[in-house]
């Protein structure tokens, strides 16, 4: 094949090599960019910046090598359009630093930075951590900080991510109230901060105020849906990112729902209760307080992380006709109380029969479809032992 005269020449089925001295000053309009998986660039002293727009359209790129070139700056978002990138070699350039954001979101198996005049500061704490943790082949490079010494020796005690404190109201918050949250950000080299409110949806009207180091957030006309929803404050500096989430408790009265009893392993009278603070519960049976036992007890399902409603069952272990009746669930919190009732019939009363009717005496056969090994009771077939005391 004839030698390729262009600045960049195909290499294999999906590679490109750009090695002609000084031919590139940016990576715009590379031929066949959308299918490239490998890009090798060398001896490009005019290629000094790598930015978001340079790698747009290189979505399939896996290996990027820019060596012995003039690269001075790599933008924090430079690799946003190359999420599959797994090998990045930027050795022997003029890089003094590289932001943690540049590699965030990538799954780099290899990151080569040797031969750059790196300047040690907290901005390279993430790289020092990679070296400590043996990531990306960094330890083998024995990276040096220009004028100082091995990156491994850089003191890092003061290299922390921002510290966040979110102040929430102490007093109880009612539906319709306005709530002011304040996020206090401390730390060195603060760059950006803000709120993440994705969970809030229609829970309140949101108004942001202020900026670093004190961010304000007003949640106006709050609804009970705001409960259990995360309001997150975040901040970034040259070391990394910190997030703190808080929840605002919006008080609202207890409510309760009961559903028809269902037979599972035990019988279950399903219920749902809601309220903030969480209501206390009490069961009544035929109007009297029902004392729970190991045979009749309340059991809650695992609560959903982002809602106040609790679902559960009144569990009845092998209830008989004596358990038939009216079940009432009372729920109360400081803002109100609610109740719901339901009739439950677990078993017919065996003593309510016509003396003329024959008394069944046979056992039911075991139901072969049953998932448990216990005999399955069937109405009108179930045998009852009748003992008569004689004395």
């Amino acid at each position: 094949a004839a030698p390729c005269p262009d600045a960049c020449c195909p290499h294999g089925s999906s590679g490109l090599r750009c090695t002609r001295d000084g031919a590139l000053d940016s990576l715009h309009h590379l031929p066949g960019a959308e299918n490239l998986t490998e890009l090798y660039i060398e001896n490009q002293q005019h290629l000094q910046h790598l930015e978001l727009r340079d790698l747009r359209g290189l979505g399939e790129l896996r290996n990027l090598t820019i060596v012995k070139s003039g690269l001075r700056f790599v933008a924090p978002d430079a690799f946003h359009f190359t999420p599959r990138l797994s090998r990045l070699n930027l050795s022997f350039n003029a890089l003094e630093s590289l932001s943690w954001k540049t590699v965030q979101g990538l799954s780099l198996q290899e990151l080569v930075l040797s031969g750059n005049p790196l300047h040690c500061s907290c901005a390279l704490r993430w790289l020092q951590r990679w070296e400590e943790e043996g990531l990306g082949g960094v330890p083998e490079q024995k990276l040096q900080c220009h004028g100082q010494g091995p990156l491994a020796h850089m003191p890092n005690a003061s290299c922390g991510v921002p510290t966040l404190k979110v102040q929430v109201p102490n007093a109880s918050v009612d539906v319709g109230d306005d709530v002011l949250l304040r996020c206090q950000v401390e730390g060195r080299g603060l760059e950006q901060a803000g709120w993440i409110l994705t969970e809030l949806e229609q829970s309140a009207t949101v108004m942001k105020s202020g900026g670093l180091p004190s961010l304000g957030l007003t949640l106006a006309n709050v609804t009970s849906d705001l409960n259990r929803k995360n309001v997150t404050c975040w901040a970034e500096n040259d070391v990394g990112r910190a997030e703190v989430s808080v929840q605002v408790n919006v008080s609202f009265p207890a409510s309760v729902q009961l559903h028809t009893a269902v037979e599972m392993h035990h019988w279950c009278i399903p219920f749902s209760v809601d309220g903030q603070p969480a209501p206390s519960l009490r069961w009544l049976f035929n109007g009297s307080v029902l004392n729970e036992t190991s045979f009749i007890f309340t059991e809650f399902l695992e609560p959903a992380a982002n809602e106040t409603v609790r679902h559960g069952c009144l569990r009845l272990n092998q209830p008989t006709h004596v358990n038939n009746g009216n079940y009432t669930l009372l729920a109360a919190n400081p803002f109100g109380q609610a109740s719901a009732s339901i009739m439950a019939a677990f078993m017919d009363n065996p003593f309510e029969f016509n003396p003329e009717d024959p008394i069944p005496v046979s056992f039911s056969p075991v139901d072969t479809n049953s998932t448990s090994g216990d005999p399955v009771e069937k109405k009108d077939e179930t045998p009852f032992g009748v003992s008569v005391a004689v004395g």
């Epitope: 500061s121 004028g147 100082q148 010494g149 020796h153 850089m154 003191p155 060195r188």
Partner: antibody, heavy 119, light 106 residues
Framework: QVQLVQSGAEVKKPGASVKVSCKAS????????MHWVRQAPGQGLEWIGT????????SFAQKFQGRVTLTRDTSTSTAYMELSSLRSEDTAVYYC????????????WGQGTTVTVSS | DIQMTQSPSSLSASVGDRVTITCRAS?????LYWFQQKPGKAPKPLIY???SLGSGVPSRFSGSGSGTDYTLTISSLQPEDFATYYC?????????FGGGTKVEIK
């Protein structure tokens, strides 16, 4: 113990060059960056540049770019700083100092070399 | 470059006095270094990494601070402490020095 011994005072004419030496002893010369700092009479300290004797990597303050050359001789554990196109404002005491990476600071300084630029 | 501003530029004090010198960086830094220099001598390292004492430095010297504001304190000034003190940063390239604070006998 660790020592940096510098060459003697120099008097130069404007436009000339001066080469100051800094001989290191008591440690592995090639392992630590050597920096050069100067101090004009009655003034503060001003950083000039640095060299890594292990591989001759070097860098300089913008102000001295193109006028300063940093070299080293590993066989004698000596670092050199050459400043060309001298002007009267280059009159100063020139110091070499080692950057000690274990504790991350300039821990040992040479005694200084006075360079006077005068016509 | 990060600018280092020392204050005061000079001060007069007596033996036994408590002396505080401040150094402010034009942007946040991780660590600060302090040097003592006597006339005709090379700078001598006093404090490294903000608060660690250099070898052979008496405990009356102490350093503190974070972000952009740092201080050097001499708890009880001794005759040998009359000198010029410089702060220096190497958080960010290039290393830069403060303008110096001359401590003179009152």
């Amino acid at each position: 113990q660790v020592q940096l011994v510098q060459s003697g005072a120099e008097v130069k004419k404007p436009g000339a060059s001066v080469k100051v030496s800094c001989k290191a002893s008591g440690y592995t010369f090639t392992e630590y960056w050597m920096h050069w700092v100067r101090q004009a009479p009655g003034q503060g300290l001003e950083w000039i540049g640095t060299i890594y004797p292990g591989n001759s990597d070097s860098s300089f303050a913008q102000k001295f770019q193109g006028r300063v050359t940093l070299t080293r001789d590993t066989s004698t554990s000596t670092a050199y700083m050459e400043l060309s196109s001298l002007r009267s404002e280059d009159t100063a005491v020139y110091y070499c100092t080692r950057f000690y990476y274990e504790d991350w600071y300039f821990d040992v300084w040479g005694q200084g070399t006075t360079v006077t630029v005068s016509s | 470059d990060i600018q280092m501003t020392q204050s005061p530029s000079s001060l007069s004090a007596s033996v036994g006095d408590r002396v505080t010198i401040t150094c402010r960086a034009s942007s946040s830094i991780s660590y600060l270094y302090w040097f003592q220099q006597k006339p005709g001598k090379a700078p001598k390292p006093l404090i490294y990494r903000t608060s660690s004492l250099g070898s052979g430095v008496p405990s009356r010297f102490s350093g503190s601070g974070s972000g952009t504001d740092y201080t050097l304190t001499i708890s009880s000034l001794q005759p040998e402490d009359f000198a010029t003190y410089y702060c220096q940063q190497y958080h960010s390239y290039p290393p830069t020095f403060g303008g110096g604070t001359k401590v003179e006998i009152k």
